[in-house]
């Protein structure tokens, strides 16, 4: 089996506020079983912005049909964009398990805030 | 306590068609992978077919695949399997299985590599 | 396939440990089934290479590495006395067995 890849094509993504942000990931396996989750940051600080399993995200939708069971595009929207949005969002595969365990992270995608035009 | 009851079993004959029902409790089934185990006489556990926790996803073993279909009734909380035209090596005891790990999102597949509860077993006896 | 010694044996308070080899990557899962008698209903004593289902004895413990897994049974007493099934998945199986291990419990 291929090892399973966490792709995250862009390096940055520049937004102006109040805009929404597209922030893209794709897998490259539907194995090792587990939900993807979206961070800002990284290490034990890092804030979750994006859970598949569970929980409530009223700002985050997913742009691809996520109900879907080959679906292998965890991209995600992010709506009404400020500057505090500002930072490095990580797309995470979690192996399922008693808890999941991260398994692989994408390299990462800055965005930035641009002032909202007059 | 989560519990797994199978019925359905006893003596068939050659060619028939059986309906094994597996009735869970103390869970959701519509949170979890099922699936079906089987053991001949004197023999080992033998995967025969499971159903992923979304309710489409199946997958069966060649030994069943064309005869067998497997089938959950959230409601009822049960899982059925249905096997077609049986053949002697279709005896042994059926296991209902349930995977431990909760899955209601779309990205799981139909595995039972993680079981944690079984049932008792029901008796099926292909003969004529 | 799942590949584990067909028998073992030991005294009442050895440690015993049972292997189990596949062509497991990382990806899937081992788990061991405890039967005490053919046809009867197993038993899960271990789950996720490692966790213990409530109710089990703390004797029992399991571990993972690479394509190999073993369950330890520290301290065995007669009534662990069974077949032990190991099971995983591959790539185009939602479950495998080995062919089990009986465990024989002397004195």
């Known amino acids: 089996e291929e090892e399973l890849q966490v792709i995250q094509p862009d390096k940055s993504v520049s937004v102006a506020a109040g805009e929404s942000a597209i922030l893209h990931c794709t897998v490259t396996s539907l194995i090792p079983v587990g939900p993807i989750q979206w961070f800002r940051g990284a290490g034990p600080a890092r804030e979750l912005i994006y859970n598949q399993k569970e929980g409530h995200f009223p700002r985050v939708t997913t742009v691809s049909e996520s109900t879907k069971r080959e679906n292998m595009d965890f991209s995600i929207s992010i709506s009404n964009i400020t500057p505090a949005d500002a930072g490095t969002y990580y797309c995470v595969k979690f192996r399922k398990g008693s808890p999941d365990t991260e398994f692989k992270s994408g390299a990462g995608t800055e965005l930035s805030v641009r002032a909202k035009p007059s | 306590a989560v519990t797994l009851d199978e019925s359905g079993g006893g003596l068939q004959t050659p060619g028939r068609a059986l309906s094994l029902v597996c009735r869970g409790s103390g869970f959701s089934i519509s949170s979890y992978n099922m699936g079906w185990v089987r053991q001949a006489p004197g023999k080992g556990l033998e995967f025969i077919a499971s159903?992923?926790?979304?309710?489409?996803?199946?997958h069966y073993a060649p030994a069943v695949k064309g005869r067998a279909t497997i089938t959950r009734d959230v409601g009822q909380s049960t899982v059925r399997l249905q096997l077609n035209n049986l053949r002697a090596e279709d005896t042994g005891t059926y296991f209902c299985?349930?995977?431990?790990?909760?899955?209601?999102?779309?990205?799981?597949?139909?595995?039972?590599?993680?079981?944690?509860?079984w049932g008792h077993g029901t008796e099926v006896i292909v003969s004529s | 396939a799942l590949t584990q010694p067909s028998s073992v044996s030991a005294n009442p308070g050895e440690t015993v440990k049972i292997t189990c080899s596949g062509d497991?990557?990382?990806?899937?899962?081992y788990g061991w089934y405890q039967q005490k008698s053919p046809g009867s209903a197993p038993v899960t004593v271990i789950y996720y290479n490692d966790k213990r289902p409530s109710g089990i004895p703390s004797r029992f413990s399991g571990s993972a590495s690479g394509s190999t897994a073993t369950l330890i049974i520290t301290g065995v007493q007669v009534e662990d006395e069974a077949v032990y099934f190991c099971g995983s998945a591959d790539s185009s199986n939602p479950a495998i067995f080995g062919a089990g291990t009986t465990l024989t419990v002397l004195g």
């Open positions: 299985a349930k995977d431990a790990y909760q899955c209601s999102y779309a990205t799981c597949n139909d595995y039972l590599d993680t079981i944690d509860a």
């Open positions: 159903i992923g926790s979304d309710g489409s996803s199946t």
């Open positions: 497991n990557s990382a990806h899937y899962y």
